[in-house]
């Protein structure tokens, strides 16, 4: 089995607890992989304001994960 690594995770630190819904352009979920041993929720902000990592344990992240999974499966 490949060793799980933290070194290539996209998120640095634990992530913010919430992002204003009005500021969200899109949400991406990165599932644990060879590169990173944790789930990452990355929010792309509107108006070219970049991206933010959302704390995957936060209420907002859990809602987004649920919504995305419902859409995909």
């Amino acid at each position: 089995f490949p060793m799980f690594k933290r070194g290539r995770c996209l998120c640095i630190g634990p992530g913010v607890k919430a992002v204003k819904v009005a500021d969200i352009e899109k949400a991406s979920i990165m599932y644990p992989s060879n590169n990173c041993d944790k789930i990452e929720v990355i929010i792309t902000l509107k108006e070219n304001k970049g991206q933010r990592c959302l704390n995957p344990k936060s209420k907002q992240a859990r809602l987004i994960i649920k919504k995305v999974e419902r859409k995909n499966f």
Epitope: C11, I12, G13, P14, G15, V16, V19, R52
Partner: nanobody, 129 residues
Framework: EVQLVESGGGLVQAGGSLRLSCAAS????????MGWFRQTPGKDREFVAV???????????EYADSVKGRFTISRDNAKNTAYLQMNSLKFEDTAVYYC???????????????????WGQGTQVTVSS
């Protein structure tokens, strides 16, 4: 939200040293990604240095090429303070220096000012030649 207050700026001769401090209050400091940026009139904020929590009670750091080997970023979690030790200062280091904090920084955008949520008011550093 974290409140940040910088101090330690001033006037120094080329070749001299300064240590900037950034005192944080109102949030979890340990896991904050702490960045230093600088700005000169009419220009965008320029990345200087960043230090982030690796999740293993240790920190990693990254520096702009222009300051590598001269500047060192560090922190004292007990004091909720980040530092920027600046040695061998050059005339071109003259700028207003800002510290920034973020919990949700994406690695790809670590050098981008828009990645940080909270900012200090800035401290002026002037290097005379």
């Amino acid at each position: 939200e974290v409140q940040l207050v910088e101090s330690g700026g001033g006037l120094v001769q080329a070749g001299g040293s300064l240590r900037l401090s950034c005192a944080a209050s109102g949030g979890t400091f340990t896991k904050q990604t702490m960045g230093w940026f600088r700005q000169t009139p009419g220009k965008d904020r320029e990345f200087v240095a960043v230090q982030w929590w690796t999740g293993l009670s240790t920190y990693s750091a990254e520096y702009a090429d222009s300051v590598k080997g001269r500047f060192t970023i560090s922190r004292d979690n007990a004091k909720n303070t980040a530092y920027l030790q600046m040695n061998s200062l050059k005339f071109e280091d003259t700028a207003v220096y800002y510290c920034a904090a973020g919990l949700g920084v994406v690695r790809t955008f670590i050098r981008r000012a828009s990645s940080y949520d909270d900012w200090g008011q800035g401290t002026q550093v002037t290097v005379s030649s």
